[in-house]
């Protein structure tokens, strides 16, 4: 029998420096987790210790907090090279600033392969991308040698910026070819390695031959055997195993998100590749492992960057930017309709000649927005204004949801209005009017949404059965502020970008801002 | 007053199975590395596995003369470590001590030891 | 596996003699990480459980008393008593942590005069 020690990481999304245990900026160091100075530390400890040991990520390092708004990848692989990782998969989010941004700062840059079997370039740049991501490499590990094989959301043009010479193919018919290859180059130990979300790698695990093990990401699973050592609740144990269609126990692991976790699996082979047996956990990188040193030392040169940064205008104002409790708990404020019209700007993907764009509406908890934007400061925008507005590190994600649901939440929006509470929605391609002096739970009298299958825009009245994209902040997805509706009976839920990324980005790309309050929630007369 | 008391140890033929406890008090268990160290009559000491603390998953190591036949596990609410042995052989008879190693990273020896437990493999 | 030899296998001494015993590892227990030695000693009296003295090769664990010594680096050690007592009679043991398996030596064997 041989023993491998699968080391791995998943949507870290730019949590270089240590985090608070929600994986928000970091406050009180002594109860802070993850980074990478710590994650080396551990990872340095287990390849002492272990003597068959593979690090490998399952993509969107990119995206989440100004590292990648300022470095813009260099920073990934410039410390995933410090850490040595073996290998990485391509996820949706490192098509964030297109395939230029893909290509030259991590592709050129990154001293470890870079996979992904279900991509696919053609023209131009088929050749200009040659060889700098595979779908599969052959590593050596000890005496042996191990195949991972790649692979990346078949969604990511809806999610991200990949352009039009990339096409994104189905996984299993894209992987179970490289898995073939793979075994007629007598590699008998293959790890699928990549960032489609739990389900898909179940059935990766299930529908394509020869995978011994499936390593992901995008879905933040985290799953764990025996008592959790912090918040997270686990979706199942680890490894999660999954009998494939020819018989065999495959192990699927996934590490949550942010770098708070190490997940760590053990395989044992027999000779001819099969997998014997499999446990392990993640291994939760609290304040109880050591910074290294010397990584902690370079994430602080690199760091006095980001702080420059902050304070740098992104744009201007020319109208007062009312983020207040006041205003953002009990109408339409301008704030909010700024943040919405930002979510859906970041979200424009023209896949389709039949839709203007594939989403249309946002919404957005009042309780959200933190703080106003002056704009008797000479107009001036800074990063650091728009973390007081959001100082919560959440990102603005895609839902798909039916009309039912959406009608729930703007129920929920009201259902105890007049008390200041964070539930309040503040929208972008929604007209919405309340009768207040109707019951809680019956207040939504008129409810229209912008259409996303029409050469110009308009509002139609919501249909109850039909399903709908939605952008919305993490928080809300999750159930937040009492959205319990939205967890329970979402259709599909991608994370997207950092908040504050998505909304800085815009003001950059409009230069002069003037959001106005414009009627997009309005209260039927004599109720308010 | 830190403390680790086995139990469970006891005459087994060849072949058979045992299941040893390790009672600790004094100490927050959850925290801690357990191992467990075995030391046959009038010889050196062994290293038989760890079971990492909750934080790194409560996963386990094994040395090679054990694997597949001994188990650790534990008990955290309980503050119980446990040592399943299967398949038992005579060369397993030993004076089994429960240890717990320091809490502070990497440090992987052996600060606590019970007073442990005699184990006999004999027809 | 990392393989750890003692020597000598046992020793007589007086009271108050000085006493040094040794230990080599079959590879290098310093690691560059951190430049510390993964090395432990114990003492293990007549009858009783063993007894943590030394770590990281040096470091004397709390209420040691300061007679027992740890030195050395890599693959080379050494554990000295400046004036053994007769309370000192026991074997004592040393173990690498840097990998798995953990490994003991075979112990040294001090006995009194």
């Known amino acids: 029998a041989w023993e491998l020690t699968i080391l791995h990481t998943n949507d870290v999304h730019s949590r270089l420096e240590q985090t608070s245990e929600d994986s928000s900026k970091c406050v009180n160091a002594s109860r802070c987790m993850g980074g990478v100075a710590r994650l080396f530390t551990k990872v340095q400890q287990i390849r002492r210790a272990e003597p068959n040991v593979l690090l490998l990520d399952a993509g969107d390092q990119y995206q989440g907090t100004i590292w990648f708004t300022v470095y813009k990848g260099a920073e990934v692989a410039h410390f995933m090279n410090a850490l040595r990782y073996d290998a990485m998969a391509l996820g949706n989010h490192e098509f964030d600033n297109g395939v230029e941004g893909l290509i030259e700062p991590l592709l050129k840059e990154a001293k470890f392969p870079i996979l992904s079997a279900n991509i696919k370039a053609k023209g131009p740049l088929a050749s200009q991308i040659s060889g700098l991501y595979l779908p599969y490499k052959v590593l050596p590990v000890g005496d042996e040698v191990v195949g991972i094989v790649g692979y990346t959301s078949k969604e990511t043009p809806f999610l991200s910026n990949p352009g039009t010479n990339l096409v994104f193919e189905d996984e299993i018919t894209a992987l179970q070819p490289e898995v073939d290859k793979l075994k007629t180059l007598n590699v008998n130990k293959i790890i699928a390695l990549g960032h489609s979300g739990f389900e898909m790698d179940k059935l990766i695990a299930q529908k394509v031959r020869g995978v011994d093990v499936v390593v992901g990401g995008h879905s933040n699973t985290f799953l764990y055997t025996g008592n959790p050592p912090s918040k997270e609740v686990p979706a199942g144990k680890y490894p999660f195993i999954v009998t494939s269609d020819d018989g065999r126990k495959v192990p699927v692991v996934q590490a949550y998100a942010f770098g708070k976790y190490l997940g760590y699996l053990k395989i044992e082979f027999d000779e001819r590749g099969n997998v014997i047996s499999s446990h392990g956990n993640p291994i939760l990188l609290n304040s109880s492992i050591p910074e290294d040193p010397s990584i902690k030392a370079d994430i602080n040169k690199w760091r006095i960057k980001l702080d420059n940064y902050s304070t740098q205008e992104l744009g201007k104002t020319i109208v007062y930017l009312d983020g207040s409790s006041q205003s953002c708990r009990f109408r339409e404020c301008n704030m909010g309709n700024l943040i919405c019209d930002a979510m859906i700007n970041n979200n424009l993907r023209h896949t389709d000649e039949m839709f203007w764009n594939h989403v249309s509406m946002c919404i957005l908890n009042g309780g959200g927005i933190r703080s106003p934007i002056d704009e008797r400061n000479n107009g001036t925008i800074t990063w650091e204004n728009l973390a007081a507005v959001l100082p919560f590190g959440g990102t603005f994600d895609l839902v798909q949801l039916k009309g039912s649901t959406l009608k729930k939440a703007f129920e929920h929006s009201v259902h105890r209005y007049g008390q200041s509470t964070g539930e309040f929605l503040q929208v972008g391609g929604i007209h919405v009017v309340y009768d207040l002096s109707r019951k809680p739970g019956d207040r939504v009298v008129k409810l229209d949404v912008l259409c996303t299958k029409c050469r110009v825009p308009s509002y139609d009245p919501l249909k109850m059965d039909e399903v709908y994209k939605v952008i919305l902040p993490n928080f809300l997805a999750n159930g937040g502020d009492g959205f319990q509706m939205i967890k329970d009976e979402l259709l599909r839920h991608d994370s997207g970008d950092q908040d504050i990324n998505v909304v800085s980005t815009y003001i950059s790309k409009m230069k002069v801002i003037y959001p106005a309050v414009e009627g997009r929630i309005k209260f039927s007369t004599g109720s308010h | 007053e830190v403390k680790l008391v086995e139990s469970g140890g006891g005459l087994v033929q060849p072949g058979g199975s045992l299941r040893l406890s390790c009672a600790a008090s004094g100490f927050t268990f959850t925290d801690y590395y357990m191992s467990w160290v075995r030391q046959p009559p009038g010889k050196a000491l062994e290293w038989l596995g760890f079971i990492r603390n909750k934080a790194d998953g409560s996963t386990t190591e094994y040395s090679a003369s054990v694997k597949g036949r001994f188990t650790i596990s534990r008990d955290n609410s309980q503050s119980i470590l446990y040592l399943q042995m299967n398949a038992l052989r005579p060369e397993d008879s030993a004076t089994y001590y429960c240890?717990?190693?320091?809490?502070?990273?990497?440090?992987?020896?052996?600060?606590?030891w019970g007073t442990g437990t005699t184990v006999t493999v004999s027809s | 596996d990392i393989v750890m030899s003692q020597s000598p296998s046992s020793l007589a001494v007086s009271v108050g003699e000085k006493v040094t015993m040794t230990c080599k590892s079959s590879q290098s227990l310093l690691y560059s990480n951190n430049q510390k030695n993964y090395l432990a000693w114990y003492q293990q009296k007549p009858g009783q459980s063993p007894k943590l003295l030394i770590y990281w090769a040096s470091t004397r664990e709390s209420g040691v008393p300061d007679r027992f010594t740890g030195s050395g680096s890599g693959t080379d050690f050494t554990l000295t008593l400046s004036s053994v007592k007769a309370e000192d009679l026991a074997v004592y043991y040393c173990q690498q942590y840097y990998s798995y398996p953990f490994t003991f030596g075979s112990g040294t064997k001090l006995e009194i005069k």
């Open positions: 240890t717990r190693s320091p809490i502070y990273f990497d440090n992987w020896y052996f600060d606590v």
